[in-house]
């Protein structure tokens, strides 16, 4: 009758931070000699626990190994980290000088389940304009096992990524994912969101989401119109300059009279549209009795540090 080392579980999965028990039982108390636990095989194997007086942080024996009849050499590993992943072997030695390895268990593979970090979505450094194609990147790291699903959505519609990569490609303690998607901007996107959704075995069917608000990545330039209202009195003309459907809010409006600055507006009361864009109306009262000749009035709109948009209007002299 030869001693057998029984490791009943081929594999165990444990969430990072939790503890796990690796079971090992022997069929014999003989021959006399120590039992040791190793991770890995061959020369590079690492001693995890020895049923002696040595102290091993985070690893404890499950049963009282000092009891003469004890055949249970299971261990508990607490506060498991992704670095603890690997195959663990319970090994029986025969006492001698040196001790001789006589039997090993079949091994128990420990899979450490580590949650992916909340996905982070990044977009272009500069705002894009409608009809422009812009790329968004989603990154999540620190997860294990390697299997992971990443999906992109824009306003509820799934988008197909340009590429998705999980690194490293080989076996590792934890993994990272990076995915890039291309979005064609349109003028209605101020209220739109691009969502990166990550699903993993550790997340209990509640995927993690990273969100990019397109309002941070889009510029909608205003449509600028100057109109003349019916005169309220014989010697007064009302000019209106309307900047419509622009985003973001940053707007400067200047009135010029024959090319000379007449008034500087820093808009405060913007009107917000349902699509998230803004409108602004500036009124300019012209005293027509002061003008014998035709006067060219210019409304100059500077939006979000872009080149000025100018619209001219001629008021005929009296």
């Amino acid at each position: 009758t030869e001693v057998k080392v029984i490791q009943p579980e081929k594999s165990v999965s444990v969430a990072a931070g939790d503890s796990t028990v690796l079971n090992c039982t022997l069929t014999s108390l003989l021959p006399v000699g120590p039992i040791r636990w190793y991770r890995g095989v061959g020369q590079s194997r690492q001693l995890i626990y020895s049923f002696t007086t040595e102290h091993f942080p985070r690893v404890t024996n499950v049963s009282d190994a000092t009891k003469r009849s004890n055949l249970d050499f299971s261990i508990r590993i607490s506060n498991v980290t992704p670095e603890d992943a690997g195959t663990y072997y319970c090994v029986k030695f025969q006492r001698g000088s040196p001790d001789t390895e006589i039997q090993s268990g079949g091994g128990t593979e420990v899979y450490v389940l580590a949650k992916p970090s909340p996905p982070e979505v990044s977009g272009p450094a500069d705002r894009g304009i409608p009809d422009q194609k812009v790329n968004f990147t989603c990154k999540s790291h620190g997860f294990s096992p390697r299997n992971i699903t990443l999906k992109w959505f824009k306003d509820g519609q799934e988008l197909h990524p340009l590429e998705t990569t999980v690194n490293p490609s080989g076996k590792n303690v934890s993994y990272n994912i990076s995915s890039t998607v291309r979005v064609v901007l349109n003028s209605m996107d101020v209220n739109s969101k691009v969502i990166c959704e990550v699903a993993h075995i550790t997340l209990d069917r509640s995927p993690l989401r990273g969100i990019a608000n397109l309002s941070n990545f889009i510029r909608v330039s205003p449509t600028v119109k100057v109109t003349q209202q019916s005169p309220t009195s014989m010697n007064q003309v009302n000019l209106t300059c309307r900047a419509e459907r622009f985003y973001p809010e940053d707007l400067q409006l200047i009135w010029l009279e024959n090319g000379n600055v007449s008034r500087n507006d820093t808009p405060k009361n913007l009107t917000k549209n349902t699509d998230g864009t803004y409108n602004y109306t500036s009124l300019f009262l012209v005293n027509s009795s002061a003008h014998r000749e035709d006067v060219v009035f210019t409304c100059q709109v500077k939006h979000d540090q872009q080149p000025a948009i100018t619209r001219n209007h001629t008021v005929l002299g009296f």
């Epitope: 028990v21 069929t27 014999s28 108390l29 003989l30 006399v32 499950v62 049963s63 009849s69 055949l71």
Partner: antibody, heavy 119, light 107 residues
């Protein structure tokens, strides 16, 4: 002082499953480093170890019976149980439950329960 | 499985006699051996553990010795209440196995 008491039907029909329970009093089944065993004794014969459950979890079975035996524990009721399936007349015996002591011997035994397999 | 061979299978001795029972293991079991006494209609009772250690409360006329494959159980002075069957049991290897028993009677 720990005491053990076996309970279960005294008569089982061939091919059926024999089910016995051992109730532990005077101590907790989940404390200390003990084996809780089932042993049987055929009429006029010697003792045969069926199997044991160790306090830390492992269950050990006699290979000659392993395919038919299940030993389990219910810590909430302070009981451990034996199930022996597909019984025949050869399973007629007195069935004992026992507890291993602080040392290695079985120092506490139930009084035994006779199980007869007959149609 | 480890075979435990007990001899004799039965013996008859007078009160006060020294009684010796032997138990032989089919392979080395070190000192992983226990001895039990079973009286008719009763459950076994532990007398000796680890080959030579007397269980608490057991009279000192009972003793055990041996190591490896050969073990001896001795009653130094047989008493009428010692009428019983005695079993050796090894726990070095699974499955644990018992000897066939030695029935002790009074002449």
């Amino acid at each position: 002082q720990v005491q053990l008491q076996e309970s279960g039907p005294g008569l089982v029909k061939p091919s059926q499953t024999l089910s016995l329970t051992c109730t532990v009093s005077g101590g907790s089944i989940s404390s200390g480093g003990y084996y809780w065993s089932w042993i049987r004794q055929h009429p006029g014969k010697g003792l045969e170890w069926i199997g044991a459950i160790y306090y830390s979890g492992p269950i050990y079975y006699n290979p000659s019976l392993k395919s038919r035996v299940t030993i389990s524990v219910d810590t909430s009721k302070n009981q451990f149980s034996l199930k022996l399936s597909s019984v025949t007349a050869a399973d007629t015996a007195v069935y004992y439950c026992s507890k291993e002591g602080y040392h290695s011997g079985m120092d506490v035994w139930g009084q035994g329960t006779t199980v007869t397999v007959s149609s | 499985d480890i075979q435990m061979t007990q001899s004799p299978s039965s013996l008859s001795a007078s009160v006060g006699d020294r009684v010796t029972i032997t138990c032989q293991a089919s392979q080395d079991i070190s000192d992983y051996l226990n001895w039990y006494q079973q009286k008719p209609g009763k459950a076994p009772k532990l007398l000796i553990y680890d080959a030579d250690n007397l269980e608490t409360g057991v009279p000192s006329r009972f003793s055990g010795s041996g190591s490896g494959t050969d073990f001896t159980f001795t009653i130094s002075s047989l008493q009428p209440e010692d009428i019983a069957t005695y079993y050796c049991q090894q726990f070095a290897y699974l499955p644990w196995t018992f000897g066939g028993g030695t029935k002790v009677e009074i002449k």
